[in-house]
Interface confidence: low
């Protein structure tokens, strides 16, 4: 079943998706698509990363997080009612049928009032384990669920909105560390 996320018309929607690179520089291709995850790849691709970079994206769709550390959460700018629906985050782990697939449901609500331009909303999660991903940037704490038997750890967050992105950053940078792998 899909995890549901909400945003209002005119705001930015945020669909969280994370993985942990097995080693520095060991990035894994990721695709985001509109519609539930198919057997292979993503349908109606809106954004794609490869082993080094974001190599494809379409208007209004972008990664605000630090994708080099595995934060491949999707931001959709200035959403409309037409943006409602299922989105697929697919972590394309090498090997046959190894991909991690996550379906996230986006529900767009009509704006109560005409929205002033706002910053992106951030979300945080509540899982029982913590991981600090490693790169050469500041530590970013991400909350994790159960870990699969592979060197890549994937989560999608179950979250309430944090209205102030600074708060989300403070939570991410709070420094709890468990080394995995």
């Amino acid at each position: 079943s899909e995890v549901e996320y909400r945003a209002e018309v005119g705001q930015n929607a945020y669909l969280p998706c994370f993985y942990t690179p097995a080693a520095p520089g060991n990035l894994v291709p990721v695709c985001w698509g509109k519609g539930a995850c198919p057997v292979f790849e993503c349908g109606n691709v809106v954004l794609r990363t490869d082993e080094r970079d974001v190599n494809y994206w379409t208007s209004r769709y972008w990664l605000n997080g630090d994708f080099r550390k595995g934060d491949v959460s999707l931001t959709i700018e200035n959403v409309t009612l037409a943006d409602s629906g299922i989105y697929c985050c697919r972590i394309q782990i090498p090997g046959i049928m190894n991909d991690e697939k996550f379906n996230l449901k986006l529900v767009i609500k009509p704006a109560k009032v005409t929205p002033a331009p706002t910053r992106q909303r951030d979300f945080t999660a509540a899982f029982p384990r913590m991981l600090t991903t490693r790169g050469h940037g500041p530590a970013e704490t991400q909350t994790l669920g159960s870990l699969p038997d592979i060197n890549l750890t994937q989560i999608s967050t179950l979250a309430n909105e944090l209205r102030d992105s600074r708060l989300a950053n403070d939570l991410r940078d709070s420094g709890a560390t468990i080394r995995i792998g």
């Epitope: 520089g25 990035l27 082993e51 080094r52 050469h136």
Partner: antibody, heavy 117, light 108 residues
């Protein structure tokens, strides 16, 4: 093709703040890591810091207390501010793009900043 | 902080000769995050090698990189006149990002 261009005053007085801007053309700043590096006359390269397009920053600890790097995605620019400068901060200052796995693949041509009264 | 030590400081060679430049790290560097740059007088550095051994776009195949852990090497198989310059290694896998002190390859 992406190009980087540094701009800013070539002369700064001691104790003042050095301010430089790097303009990204031919591509979007809303990807990658954007670095500042400097090179004192006749010496090697020193990394100052970077800003990720999302706004997160990382600075060289030796300069951290004096450095601020910011990004203006609407202008496709990122900036360096270095406070309380001394003659030791005289250098050629470069901006460079760091794509992550590929390293710093695109550099500006550099701008010389002299700290002198 | 990872300290990168390059040797020799200066390498005096003739065109057509083979150049071998060394970069030694004070602690292990992920080979995914080790780069080599070339810098000519009055110019910005130019990326030659990333990931310790992969040539950047447009770099001639006479340039090659190798090594892992703490010892890395840049080899120029046959020096061309335009190859005489200063070469820097850099690690970008841990903070702070650091450069080696450079090796100057000069005409003998």
């Amino acid at each position: 093709q992406v190009q980087l261009q540094e701009s800013g005053p070539g002369l700064v007085k001691p104790s003042e703040t050095l301010s430089l801007t790097c303009t990204v053309s031919g591509g979007s700043i809303s990807r990658h890591y954007w670095n500042w590096i400097r090179q004192p006359p006749g010496k090697g390269l020193e990394w100052i810091g970077y800003i990720h397009y999302s706004g997160s920053t990382n600075y060289n600890p030796s300069l951290k207390s004096r450095v601020t790097i910011s990004v203006d995605t609407s202008k496709n620019q990122f900036s360096l501010k270095l406070s309380s400068v001394t003659a030791a901060d005289t250098a050629v200052y470069y901006c460079a793009r760091d794509t992550g796995y590929y390293g710093m693949d695109i550099w500006g041509q550099g701008t010389t900043v002299t700290v002198s009264s | 902080e990872i300290v990168l030590t390059q040797s020799p400081g200066t390498l005096s060679l003739s065109p057509g000769e083979r150049a071998t430049l060394s970069c030694r790290a004070s602690q292990s560097v992920s080979s995914s995050y080790l780069a080599w740059y070339q810098q000519k007088p009055g110019q910005a550095p130019r990326l030659l090698i990333y990931g310790a051994s992969s040539r950047a776009t447009g770099i001639p195949d006479r340039f090659s990189g190798s090594g892992s852990g703490t010892d890395f090497t840049l080899t120029i198989s046959r020096l061309e006149p335009e190859d005489f310059a200063v070469y820097y290694c850099q690690q970008y896998g841990s903070s702070p990002l650091t450069f080696g002190g450079g090796t100057k390859v000069e005409i003998k």
